[in-house]
């Protein structure tokens, strides 16, 4: 039997994926559970199998269609159910009505590249992935740069309060190795949260020019 305190949290990537995590204190690790999604105004429904990610939590991705297809809109409500197998039948463990565009978490930005690098500055660009056209320009970004001898957690956050898919890093040290990451967040949504950080982009500033002999 499954009992104890439970949590059921899902996010929509704004296109064709709903990712869910179900946690249950006292649940058996080998319990077979799934998430079932029923939109209120669509002909389709979808199921995914919850797989263990830790001692008491399971996760799965509801794949609603092709990665860039717009499967849900701002007016959709999706009823999400957690079902766990008990003997020969499925038992409903939780029911949640979910407004996709109130629960957004986009995919991490991709295609990071150095556009131009100098001794003290570096221009970097990136792209957003699988983001709805509904946002138009209503996105913001956070970026961070890893300096030698520091950790990511120590890196100051740079905030871009508009849809700007590039940044010019300044006051860098010449001939130094850095790493850079960026994440994205739509402006709308009661529970909307930051995307995961992008894969780090490594770059090196150019050496300072040698002084000329007199």
């Amino acid at each position: 039997a499954v009992n104890g305190t439970s949590q059921f949290t899902c996010f929509y990537n704004s296109r064709a994926n709903i990712s869910c995590v179900w946690s249950q204190d006292g649940a058996l690790q080998d319990t077979s559970c799934q998430v079932h999604a029923w939109p209120d105004r669509r002909r389709w429904n979808q199921t995914c199998e919850l797989l263990p990610v830790s001692q008491a939590s399971w996760a799965c991705n509801l794949i609603l269609g092709a990665p860039d297809s717009q499967k849900l809109t701002t007016v959709d409500i999706v009823t999400l159910r957690v079902l766990c197998r008990e003997g020969v039948r499925w038992r409903v463990m939780a029911i949640q009505d979910f407004k996709p565009f109130e629960n957004l978490r986009l995919m991490a930005p991709i295609s990071l590249q150095v556009v131009h690098v100098e001794t003290h500055r570096c221009n970097i660009s990136w792209e957003i992935s699988q983001a709805s056209h509904y946002f138009e320009r209503h996105l913001e970004f956070e970026a961070r740069t890893l300096s030698p001898g520091h950790t990511w957690e120590e890196a100051p956050l740079l905030t871009l309060k508009q849809k700007q898919e590039w940044i010019c890093l300044e006051t860098l040290t010449p001939d130094t190795q850095y790493e850079f990451q960026v994440r994205v967040k739509p402006l709308q949504g009661e529970f909307t949260t930051w995307s995961p950080w992008s894969q780090p982009l490594a770059f090196r500033t150019k050496p300072a020019a040698l002084g000329k002999d007199t």
Epitope: T5, S6, Q7, F8, T9, A94, Q96, D97, F98, K99, E102, N103, G189, E190, F191
Partner: nanobody, 127 residues
Framework: EVQLVESGGGLVQAGGSLRLSCAAS????????MGWFRQAPGKEREFVAA????????MYAVSTEGRFTCSRDNAKNTVYLLMNSLKPEDTAVYYC????????????????????WGQGTQVTVSS
């Protein structure tokens, strides 16, 4: 703080529908998570549904089996409970409640999580 008044209860035949309303006054409605509970004669108060401040997530008791829909209209300071395919076992006094603390909409809240309660409205389902 808000005051809550439920309405919309009554007598309905099994298989029928009712829509309960809970009107809030005297506070900032959008700063409260809202819930519905019910209490049948001789039984404990039972959770029915709870919705977050903006309505982005709503949790339902498994016993509702997808027959109930809870929604809120922050412009009208009202939360609703639409009950379809009603059964005799749905007979109870239905209470609206407000929670001042933050509610994520990812778990089943306890009645003790709610600070403010309405006076209740009777729902009777006949067979």
């Amino acid at each position: 703080e808000v005051q809550l008044v439920e309405s919309g209860g009554g007598l309905v035949q099994a298989g029928g529908s009712l829509r309960l309303s809970c009107a809030a006054s005297g506070g900032t409605f959008s700063s409260y998570a809202m819930g519905w509970f019910r209490q049948a004669p001789g039984k404990e108060r039972e959770f029915v549904a709870a919705t977050t401040r903006g309505g982005g997530r709503t949790m339902y008791a498994v016993s509702t089996e997808g027959r109930f829909t809870c929604s809120r209209d922050n412009a009208k300071n009202t939360v609703y409970l639409l009950m379809n395919s009603l059964k005799p076992e749905d007979t109870a006094v239905y209470y609206c409640a407000a929670m001042t603390s933050y509610y994520s909409g990812t778990y089943y809240p306890d009645s003790s999580d709610f600070d403010i309660w309405g006076q209740g409205t009777q729902v009777t389902v006949s067979s």
